[in-house]
């Protein structure tokens, strides 16, 4: 058993049918010595008396808020949560496996630049009685500071018969140098509590591996005289690291017809302009990627050909 | 600010070209190592990230873009001093900081070259003959060093009398390649920046 926060305790259980469970001793936080009784949750049934209460925790029915009283007055509370270990592996019931970029990906994180700021998000089908708390650091043995905000519900989607909820959090490394070469990964730890179930999820990454630039901005077309060709120009996104000659991007320019089946013409360039043939009803899209370290491409920025 | 469209300074351009070749070569070699050594811990998540140049060179600090010198988190240690006769920059552009930066890059390349050559000698003794260093990558390191053209003491190639542990050697190869790829990215960024300055 360990303390998650004041008066909230996590009992780790080897989870299988007929498991013996864990013996837990609760102590009433009071100078009083006698006349103390214990109850669980809203029930008035007295579970025991005395300054300590010994219980055998086996299932969720044994978890909850234990309260010690004296003469009708509440002295203190202890909330017991359960953390299930199923055949040597901690349970992952609360969050959905996003399966990207690989199986067992519960947390996904992205950074728009090298400033040390990043966003993580996760999915769940649970709508109520759910709380998250997020901690992060650079490295784990001698951790350096990363500050995370509160996790917030950022999107709701309908997936088949189920509703899916997306939560996200923003974090910022306390002293980040955009040009630094990372040797210790960022660690992100999410504590999830649903009713009386506790779970924790972790992700470990280098900022360089989670970079996804914003789409190029100010995408414009300039028709070339006496030609079907157009000059496409764009700019680096405002959120990208500066100077741009050091943090350079490379670009992919795509001409896409109205029909998805039509052949796509693609051009790759390090410049912020390109000359392409604009077909009727087609659209031109441009996306960006770090020129020197191949992390994710940005989303497309698009303009119609007409 | 967009990348300049002006023709790059011919004095700088060879280094930019060589540094791009270097990144391509090390990335290819790392990919080959990850595929060939699939049963070894060779992915970024599995290896220890070691930097053989740590405390010996200070490339990131010495080559910091001017715009980032205001960022205190970037200014850890900039006291290392190096020889200052680099030939990549036209002399009129050679400033002390640029020379320091290019000299630091040269020292990095020299250290990795020695490590890779020593490692290749061991890998050539492996009866499995599973993986060797790409000669193209070694040649590209050499070309960039020549383009930088710094006079520096030659480091003797390490020789080991004991029987090599091929498993450990292959894991060390993965560690070296990951670190060298990261340094090659920095070198490419620096060359691009200097080329645009």
């Amino acid at each position: 058993i360990w303390e998650l926060k004041k008066d909230v305790y996590v009992v780790e259980l080897d989870w299988y049918p007929d498991a013996p469970g864990e013996m837990v001793v609760l102590t009433c936080d009071t100078p009083e010595e006698d006349g103390i009784t214990w109850t669980l949750d809203q029930s008035s049934e007295v579970l025991g008396s005395g300054k300590t209460l010994t219980i055998q925790v086996k299932e969720f029915g044994d978890a909850g808020q234990y309260t010690c009283h004296k003469g009708g007055e509440v002295l203190s509370h202890s909330l017991l949560l359960l953390h299930k270990k199923e055949d040597g592996i901690w349970s992952t019931d609360i969050l959905k496996d996003q399966k990207e970029p690989k199986n067992k990906t519960f947390l996904r994180c992205e950074a728009k630049n090298y400033s040390g700021r990043f966003t993580c998000w996760w999915l769940t089908t649970i709508s109520t009685d759910l709380t998250f708390s997020v901690k992060s650091s650079r490295g784990s043995s001698d951790p350096q500071g990363v500050t995370c905000g509160a996790a917030t519900l950022s999107a709701e989607r309908v997936r088949g018969d189920n509703k899916e909820y997306e939560y996200s959090v923003e974090c910022q490394e306390d002293s980040a140098c955009p040009a630094a070469e990372e040797s210790l990964p960022i660690e992100v730890m999410v504590d999830a509590v649903h009713k009386l179930k506790y779970e924790n999820y972790t992700s470990s990454f280098f900022i360089r591996d989670i970079i996804k630039p914003d789409p190029p901005k100010n995408l414009q077309l300039k028709p070339l005289k006496n030609s079907r060709q157009v000059e496409v120009s764009w700019e680096y996104p405002d959120t990208w690291s500066t100077p741009h000659s050091y943090f350079s991007l490379t670009f992919c320019v795509q001409v896409q017809g109205k029909s998805k089946r039509e052949k796509k013409d693609r051009v790759f360039t390090d410049k912020t302009s390109a000359t392409v043939i604009c077909r009727k009803n087609a659209s031109i899209s441009v996306r960006a990627q770090d020129r020197y370290y191949s992390s994710s491409w940005s989303e497309w920025a698009s303009v119609p050909c007409s | 600010r967009n990348l300049p469209v002006a023709t790059p300074d011919p004095g700088m351009f060879p280094c930019l070209h060589h540094s791009q070749n270097l990144l391509r070569a090390v990335s290819n070699m790392l990919q080959k190592a990850r595929q060939t050594l699939e049963f070894y811990p060779c992915t970024s998540e599995e290896i220890d990230h070691e930097d053989i140049t740590k405390d010996k060179t200070s490339t990131v600090e010495a080559c910091l873009p001017l715009e980032l010198t205001k960022n205190e988190s970037c200014l850890n240690s900039r006291e290392t001093s190096f020889i200052t006769n680099g030939s990549c920059l036209a002399s009129r552009k050679t400033s002390f900081m640029m020379a320091l930066c290019l000299s630091s890059i040269y020292e990095d390349l020299k250290m990795y070259q020695v490590e890779f050559k020593t490692m290749n000698a061991k890998l050539l003794m492996d009866p499995k003959r599973q993986i060797f260093l790409d000669q193209n990558m070694l040649a590209v390191i050499d070309e960039l060093m020549q383009a930088l053209n710094f006079n520096s003491e030659t480091v003797p190639q390490k020789s080991s009398l004991e029987e090599p542990d091929f498993y450990k050697t292959k894991i060390k190869l993965c560690i070296l390649l990951h670190a060298f790829r990261i340094r090659a990215v920095t070198i490419d960024r620096v060359m691009s920046y200097l080329n645009a300055s």
């Epitope: 080897d14 989870w15 299988y16 049918p17 007929d18 498991a19 299932e59 969720f60 270990k85 199923e86 055949d87 040597g88 592996i89 019931d93 690989k102 199986n103 067992k104 089908t125 | 049963f39 811990p41 599995e46």
Partner: antibody, heavy 115, light 112 residues
């Protein structure tokens, strides 16, 4: 004590369907994940499928994906395996099993796919 | 389809020490715990070892398990006639959990 009693096995022609049941008692069935495992005559153990305690997630072996469906009725304390488009290579003893470091197995039920 | 490899058979005389190996990889045994089962003819498998080296109550202490790196092994010290059976190791793969990965199985024969 924990008990898993299986039923529903038998002889079936290729291409036909069969449903296996596994009735649980002696524990809170709705709190635990469950597996199906099979063993072809004279062969080793092969995992078939898994279902979460609440039925929210199901996982299948590639060899049965799209043909077999694992399900559970927590109000009846019963686990099911619906098998469709049966093939000769599905012939095996099928076991249900609890998920956990200590597990409990059903007695097994024989499924024979033969024309 | 078996990723965990066991020797097809091992044998020993009563009282001898018999060991069965189970060889896997970094993503299965290297990352997860190992179980061992004993299966007597015509019966369901019985758990012998869980969590690499823990014995459930009721399992004789002549059975012991161990794990090192990407391999595990089951040892029977002082093998007895009633130990003649098939033995299977089981683990998970970190990418496909909770799918069970079983070993190929080993037939233990007690001679004499």
């Amino acid at each position: 004590q924990v008990q898993l009693v299986q039923s529903g096995g038998g002889v079936v022609q290729p291409g036909r369907s069969l449903r296996l049941s596994c009735a649980a008692s002696g524990f809170t069935f709705s709190s635990y994940g469950m597996h199906w495992v099979r063993q072809a005559p004279g062969k080793g153990l092969e995992w078939v499928a898994f279902i979460r305690y609440d039925g929210s997630n199901k996982y299948y072996a590639d060899s049965v994906k799209g043909r077999f469906t694992i399900s559970r009725d927590n109000s009846k304390n019963t686990l099911y395996l619906q098998m469709k488009s049966l093939r000769a290579e599905d012939t095996a003893v099928y076991y249900c099993k609890t998920h956990g470091s200590h597990d409990n197995w059903g007695q097994g039920t024989m499924v024979t796919v033969s024309s | 389809s078996y990723v965990l490899t066991q020797p097809p058979s091992v044998s020993g005389t009563p009282g001898q020490r018999v060991t069965i190996s189970c060889s896997g990889g970094r993503s299965n045994i290297g990352s997860n715990t190992v179980k061992w089962y004993q299966q007597l003819p015509g019966t369901a498998p019985k758990l012998l070892i869980y969590g690499n080296d823990y014995r459930p109550s009721g399992v004789p202490d002549r059975f012991s398990g161990s794990k090192s790196g990407t391999s595990a092994s089951l040892a029977i010290t002082g093998v007895q006639a009633e130990d003649e059976a098939d033995y299977y190791c089981q683990s998970y793969d970190r990418g496909t959990h909770p799918a069970l990965l079983f070993g190929t199985g080993t037939k233990v024969t007690v001679l004499g």
